[in-house]
């Protein structure tokens, strides 16, 4: 089995995690990509994902997570803004390739968030000016691909009923053209 390596990030509450996950350009440029948390016992869970197919350089915001897929450079940029202590954990970038398991992009990210703002802006936060709030929207990310419960045969898309609102409101700096991708619940 391949040894899974980790890269450790130690940040303070309120700061921004900013990571870049490289992928093979020709093969995966337009593939849908996701940011996952690794729960106890090697149980990955998707937290946010890009559109399907993934669009070039379009930031997708899901709660406090922002994903940007740079096709030209073969990298997925992931930002988690306004970090909380509870965000501490093990994360990974993956490329969706259903029906197979997602393809993991090395390395995994070991995030450690501690109390107390350091006084210096987190990465990608140049100043406290020009900060604008993105309020909770009425849409969510397009991560659920199939309806639930699912069958072996092709399942219908989720109905557009019962679309609810993500509950986090975030502060961002120098982020333009953020799109919200709807989820069909």
């Amino acid at each position: 089995a391949t040894k899974l390596t980790e890269e450790k990030y130690e940040l303070k509450e309120g700061q921004t995690l900013d990571v870049k996950c490289d992928y093979t350009l020709e093969k995966f440029a337009s593939s849908q990509k996701a940011w996952q948390i690794i729960r106890d016992g090697e149980m990955p869970k998707t937290l946010a994902c890009t559109e399907r197919p993934s669009k070039n350089s379009h930031p997708v915001q899901v709660g406090r997570i922002i994903l940007e897929d740079y096709h030209d450079h073969g990298l997925l940029r992931v930002r988690m803004v306004n970090l909380q202590v509870e965000d501490s954990g093990l994360y990974q970038c993956v490329i969706y390739q259903p029906p197979k398991e997602p393809h993991m992009l090395f390395d995994r990210i070991r995030l450690v968030v501690t109390k107390g703002f350091s006084g210096t802006p987190g990465s990608n936060e140049n100043s406290t000016q020009n900060v604008y709030k993105i309020p909770p929207t009425t849409t969510k990310a397009l991560c659920p691909l199939y309806t639930s419960p699912r069958t072996v045969t092709q399942a219908p898309p989720k109905s557009t009923a019962d679309v609810s609102t993500p509950d986090s409101e975030i502060n961002l700096t120098n982020v333009t053209d953020i799109i919200r991708v709807p989820v069909f619940n």
């Epitope: 509870e86 659920p144 199939y146 639930s148």
Partner: antibody, heavy 123, light 112 residues
Framework: QVQLVQSGAEVKKPGASVKVSCKAS????????MHWVRQAPGQGLEWMGI????????SYAQKFQGRVTMTRDTSTSTVYMELSSLRSEDTAVYYC????????????????WGQGTMVTVSS | DIVMTQSPLSLPVTPGEPASISCRSS???????????LDWYLQKPGQSPQLLIY???NRASGVPDRFSGSGSGTDFTLKISRVEAEDVGVYYC?????????FGGGTKVEIK
Amino acid sequence: QVQLVQSGAEVKKPGASVKVSCKASGYTFTSYYMHWVRQAPGQGLEWMGIINPSGGSTSYAQKFQGRVTMTRDTSTSTVYMELSSLRSEDTAVYYCAREAGNYYDIESAFDIWGQGTMVTVSS
Amino acid sequence: DIVMTQSPLSLPVTPGEPASISCRSSQSLLHSNGYNYLDWYLQKPGQSPQLLIYLGSNRASGVPDRFSGSGSGTDFTLKISRVEAEDVGVYYCMQSRNAPWTFGGGTKVEIK
């Protein structure tokens, strides 16, 4: 349709072990996590652990560490929960439950439940 | 571990009337993605639990629209707009924000 069918009721003596099976059908078995939850008579629900049917990795509630073992057989789309060193307090209905979100989903509720297996521990 | 506290313990209801169940968690269930990892289940007498609401406020497939979930962070509510006789049973909230998954103690809904 999607369903989980569990093995029949068991009566065990204290100190013995029990192995409950849960056969999945109607979906891709290896794509969804499976959980085990138990319910003592007249009591609430208690989470025991989770297994990833794809790789077989597991995570158990602290309370059951060392006594519980969850395994799977991908050829028959079946997961198993074995509980050892049984005591009277382990008398309960044991449920397997599928986690709604697969690798590609955000949600993580238990959307499909087995019918339950009654395990009675009595001398 | 996250502790889930439900109230009331028992809820006598009149058919056609609204009902409300509260669930409180010892830690926030709001994830970085803006979703609250809180689900509601109904266990009817002699049956396995069934999913009603997931991610705090999303109705599961086939669940009547008289059921709704709300709340964020640590305080959540399940509402039944007009109780029907078939709604009797024990209602549980469950958090899946962090392992171990934990359930509330349950609220028994019965017809007056």
